[in-house]
């Protein structure tokens, strides 16, 4: 219980100003904690680098859609 209460929160304070090719992206996670100053997305690249991005930007939304589709149940 104490460990969960004191678990560190990852926040993004700055966003990348470069669009990242979806071919370089492996996964993402959303930062939704109210303890963080900004709503953010953290992309993990295929070389395991983590990059903060702005979820309001269309390329970020499109990249999340692309990664989501890779997890989807095959259509019959």
């Amino acid at each position: 219980q104490p460990d969960a209460i004191n678990a560190p929160v990852t926040c993004c304070y700055n966003f990348t100003n470069r669009k990242i090719s979806v071919q370089r992206l492996a996964s993402y996670r959303r930062i939704t904690s109210s303890k963080c100053p900004k709503e953010a997305v953290i992309f993990k690249t295929i070389v395991a680098k983590e990059i903060c991005a702005d979820p309001k930007q269309k390329w970020v939304q499109d990249s999340m859609d692309h990664l989501d589709k890779q997890t989807q149940t095959p259509k019959t």
């Epitope: 996964s27 993402y28 996670r29 959303r30 939704t32 709503e39 997305v41 979820p55 309001k56 970020v60 939304q61 499109d62 999340m64 859609d65 990664l67 989501d68 589709k69 997890t71 989807q72 149940t73």
Partner: nanobody, 123 residues
Framework: EVQLVESGGGLVQAGGSLRLPCAAS????????MGWFRQAPEKEREFVAV????????FYSSSVKGRFTISRDNAKNTVYLQMNSLKPEDTAVYYC????????????????WGQGTQVTVSS
């Protein structure tokens, strides 16, 4: 936080139609994958439909495919579930959810949930 409010539920005869809107407020609506789930009495919550952020991709459970249509209007911060050819087995509480984490139809990848709207289909 994202707040989700479903409406449009009610009592309908088998073969009828309903449209369920879900209005979102709080954070950037267009940055969330949106889904509909349902829970019938004494049953587990089940996935119904999902739509991508752009609205360009959708996916349906086999039990509703061809009868239900999910759509979204990012300008109005609203997602819709159009339900046609309703059957008594569609009776359930319908929940709208916003998907923040990577995934597609898995309930665990949806961070925000509405309170639900009751749909009852009589025979």
């Amino acid at each position: 936080e994202v707040q989700l409010v479903e409406s449009g539920g009610g009592l309908v005869q088998a073969g009828g139609s309903l449209r369920l809107p879900c209005a979102a407020s709080g954070r950037t609506f267009s940055s969330y994958r949106m889904g509909w789930f349902r829970q019938a009495p004494e049953k587990e919550r089940e996935f119904v439909a999902v739509i991508s952020r752009s609205g360009g991709d959708t996916f349906y459970s086999s039990s509703v495919k061809g009868r239900f249509t999910i759509s979204r209007d990012n300008a109005k911060n609203t997602v819709y579930l159009q339900m046609n050819s309703l059957k008594p087995e569609d009776t359930a509480v319908y929940y709208c959810a916003a998907g923040a984490q990577m995934g597609w139809a898995e309930a665990s990848t949806y961070d925000y949930w509405g309170q639900g709207t009751q749909v009852t289909v009589s025979s």
